[in-house]
Amino acid sequence: SEVEYRAEVGQNAYLPCFYTPAAPGNLVPVCWGKGACPVFECGNVVLRTDERDVNYWTSRYWLNGDFRKGDVSLTIENVTLADSGIYCCRIQIPGIMNDEKFNLKLVIKPAKVTPAPTRQRDFTAAFPRMLTTRGHGPAETQTLGSLPDINLTQISTLANELRDSRLANDLRDSGATIRIG
């Protein structure tokens, strides 16, 4: 059965997917689709990479990690209940029937708290994996760990730079990530 991941309405969801390039820079095409992995390709493609770059993505779906090192984990921005469902990460390894297919189930829960002011939502957007949870047990409440020293002026600048996956990755690893076991 699919591994289950959870996020709250209005937060960003994180669906992990990793592979190892056979040699540095020797990337493998990857597709992400909404719905279980079919026999070939991905259905309802939301993002795709080729041997060099991300060559297709749709609004709200992007790669936060360093995909050149095999981190093709999907971030879905500002999720709604409609984002619930199964997602397919397909690693298109050359060779007959060599594709690796991972079905990940995303469960979206209603937000527990009232929406924060816009500026604060920008801050949350700067840490895309925040509050994404995984597991089959009951959801847990968890407080955020220590966040980097960032003022509100910097936040608006950061928001414009989020598409730079290296920056986003550094932000993720600075202590802002929360994932419940």
């Epitope: 591994v3 990793f18 090192k69």
Partner: antibody, heavy 118, light 107 residues
Framework: EVQLVESGGDLVKPGGSLKLSCAAS????????MSWVRQIPDKRLEWVAT????????YYPDSVKGRFTISRDNAKNTLYLQMSSLKSEDTAMYYC???????????WGQGTLVTVSA | DVQMIQSPSSLSASLGDIVTMTCQAS??????LNWFQQKPGKSPKLLIH???ILEDGVPSRFSGSRYGTDFTLTISSLENEDMATYFC?????????FGGGTKLEIK
């Protein structure tokens, strides 16, 4: 529940050969890359071999390249490791491991012991 | 090859202590990192992926962090059941390489 059960470990003389098997259940074996990892007596872990889901791509570290061969039978849900020209330094507990979206060794079997000694 | 230098190789701590261990990737390489826990007589178990994301069922006293090429595993309040050997693994490059392990004992 993912289950990986290794077998075939034995005492073998240097220069000898041995074939290990790993019976898999609880997941769709044919869509997952699989690996062998060994743990030598001082408890260090060393990657031994990886095979793609369809079986046509294989990867090895230099320490076993040319001596070990990883293969799979997707119809039987079984992974294999053929070991030849065995050396005393190949003595180890051999684990088979399944990859997942989280990395190459997300699930491990219980291991099978290979001892290479005269 | 990317070497993973893990330290310390062993440590002894008391119940309730904060415990940390580190892995450093050689060659200044930033890598995708997993942490594993291995209890005596058992096979390794995945604890953390992506350098800082806990697996299902792993107690919240465990945490991972990354600073450049240095990776740290922290146990915030040591419990008896945490007595084990801990390994890191880099899986960005072939060959896959593990750290040498940190054997954690309870005083």
């Amino acid at each position: 529940e993912v289950q990986l059960v290794e077998s075939g470990g034995d005492l073998v003389k240097p220069g000898g050969s041995l074939k290990l098997s790993c019976a898999a259940s609880g997941f769709t074996f044919s869509t997952n890359g699989m690996s062998w990892v060994r743990q030598i007596p001082d408890k260090r872990l060393e990657w031994v071999a990886t095979i793609s889901s369809g079986g046509s791509n294989t990867y090895y570290p230099d320490s076993v390249k040319g001596r070990f061969t990883i293969s799979r039978d997707n119809a039987k849900n079984t992974l294999y490791l053929q070991m030849s020209s065995l050396k005393s330094e190949d003595t180890a507990m051999y684990y088979c491991a399944r990859r997942s979206e989280l990395g190459p060794f997300a699930y491990w079997g219980q291991g099978t012991l290979v001892t290479v000694s005269a | 090859d990317v070497q993973m230098i893990q330290s310390p190789s062993s440590l002894s701590a008391s119940l309730g202590d904060i415990v940390t261990m580190t892995c450093q990737a050689s060659q200044g390489s930033s890598v995708n990192l997993n942490w594993f826990q291995q209890k005596p007589g058992k096979s390794p178990k995945l604890l953390i992926h992506g350098s800082n994301i806990l697996e299902d069922g792993v107690p919240s006293r465990f945490s991972g962090s990354r600073y450049g090429t240095d990776f740290t595993l922290t146990i915030s309040s040591l419990e008896n059941e945490d007595m084990a050997t801990y390994f890191c693994l880099q899986h960005s490059y072939l060959p896959y390489t593990f750290g040498g392990g940190t054997k954690l004992e309870i005083k």
